[in-house]
């Protein structure tokens, strides 16, 4: 079994973590995918997930987390905007494949968020942008739990992460629609 590996990213409060998790295109394109934080003792907590089935290039926002699944590139893009010190932790992308265990996309991301601000170049000003402010909403049944195994039997594809400047609003490039997670009461 392959040992779980990590990539460390040190960012400042207010910045955006931008992670691309690769997956096998043909096999997992329409599978539901999720972003999880690993609690103490290898206990993943699901923070956000795509629709089921996952739609191509269709952003889903849950609080400060935005997921976008690019089927034609075989990658899940995860953005955490306006980072806070409390966001520091170990994260992973997973693909749900019930009733089997989730398929983890590697490497895991060790996020360290520190106080203060370090500016980085902004996004391309010439690109067409729509700005969305989505309130945090809740549903009990949206994401299955499906606990994750500790090791895998195949070599992990890489995750990549970028940094962008902070913004009180979320800029989604060339987006015509965004999924609002329904409220459950």
């Amino acid at each position: 079994a392959t040992k779980l590996t990590e990539e460390k990213y040190e960012l400042k409060e207010g910045q955006t973590l931008d992670v691309k998790c690769d997956y096998t295109l043909e096999k997992f394109a329409s599978s539901q995918k999720a972003w999880q934080i690993i609690r103490d003792g290898e206990m993943p907590k699901t923070l956000a997930c795509t629709e089921r089935p996952s739609k191509n290039s269709h952003p889903v926002q849950v609080g400060r987390i935005i997921l976008e699944d690019y089927h034609d590139h075989g990658l899940l893009r995860v953005r955490m905007v306006n980072l806070q010190v409390e966001d520091s932790g170990l994260y992973q992308c997973v693909i749900y494949q019930p009733p089997k265990e989730p398929h983890m996309l590697f490497d895991r991301i060790r996020l360290v968020v520190t106080k203060g601000f370090s500016g980085t170049p902004g996004s391309n000003e010439n690109s067409t942008q729509n700005v969305y402010k989505i309130p945090p909403t809740t549903t009990k049944a949206l994401c299955p739990l499906y606990t994750s195994p500790r090791t895998v039997t195949q070599a992990p594809p890489k995750s990549t992460a970028d940094v962008s400047t902070p913004d009180s609003e979320i800029n989604l490039t060339n987006v015509t629609d965004i999924i609002r997670v329904p409220v459950f009461n």
Epitope: K140, T147, P149
Partner: antibody
Framework: QVQLVQSGAEVKKPGASVKVSCKAS????????MHWVRQAPGQGLEWMGV????????SYAQKFQGRVTMTRDTSTSTVYMELSSLRSEDTAVYYC?????????????WGQGTTVTVSS | DIVMTQSPLSLPVTPGEPASISCRSS???????????LDWYLQKPGQSPQVLIY???NRASGVPDRFSGSGSGTDFTLKISRVEAEDVGVYYC????????FGGGTKVEIK
């Protein structure tokens, strides 16, 4: 229906160990974390730890580190909580509780409780 | 560790009247996904606890709509719009943001 059934009451001597079981039924055992919570007589609830029944990994409250061991048997859909080096302060009702699915981390199903008495 | 502080310790209530319990955490329970990891439980006399509210404001299945949860960050409130006799027991808040910690409990009893 979803149910957690715990083992019966125990009386132990100080310094001994106790092992409490919690048998799950009515749902997919490996898809939900299981917590252990205790309650001393006349006191509030105290979280002890959690086990992932799928892989068997655990996370314990700092207070119980080194004294508590949580295990599971997937063939019988049962989780176990063993507490060693017992002292009188460990006299309590011990509950197992299932953690909800998805975003929800509430403990949505509870066992009936197991009374453990530590007395010389 | 996060410390959870509940008030009041004891709450004598009159059936049909509203009731309110406060819970304060020593750290913010708001996660990056916009959810407050704060739950409310009721332990009726001689019974196991049962969940009332999860993620700060969401009623658990089968819980009457007279129960509601509100708040964000570090300050949370459980409200009972019209107390009924069956609502007596000890109410606990619990945080699930960093590990799991229960508040000390609030005993609700009929006047």
């Amino acid at each position: 229906q979803v149910q957690l059934v715990q083992s019966g009451a125990e009386v132990k001597k100080p310094g001994a160990s106790v092992k409490v079981s919690c048998k799950a039924s009515g749902y997919t055992f490996t898809s939900y974390y299981m917590h252990w919570v205790r309650q001393a007589p006349g006191q509030g609830l105290e979280w002890m730890g959690v086990i992932n029944p799928s892989g068997g990994s655990t996370s314990y409250a700092q207070k119980f580190q080194g004294r508590v061991t949580m295990t599971r048997d997937t063939s019988t859909s049962t989780v176990y909580m063993e507490l060693s080096s017992l002292r009188s302060e460990d006299t309590a009702v011990y509950y197992c509780a299932r953690e909800g699915s998805g975003y929800d981390e509430s403990m949505d199903v509870w066992g009936q409780g197991t009374t453990v008495t530590v007395s010389s | 560790d996060i410390v959870m502080t509940q008030s009041p310790l004891s709450l004598p209530v009159t059936p049909g009247e509203p009731a309110s319990i406060s819970c304060r955490s020593s750290q913010s329970l708001l996660h990056s996904n916009g959810y407050n990891y704060l739950d409310w439980y009721l332990q009726k006399p001689g019974q196991s606890p049962q969940v009332l509210i999860y993620l700060g404001s969401n009623r658990a299945s089968g819980v009457p709509d007279r129960f509601s949860g509100s708040g964000s960050g570090t300050d949370f409130t459980l409200k009972i719009s019209r107390v009924e006799a069956e609502d007596v027991g000890v109410y606990y808040c619990m945080q699930a943001r960093h590990g799991f910690t229960f508040g000390g409990g609030t005993k609700v009893e009929i006047k």
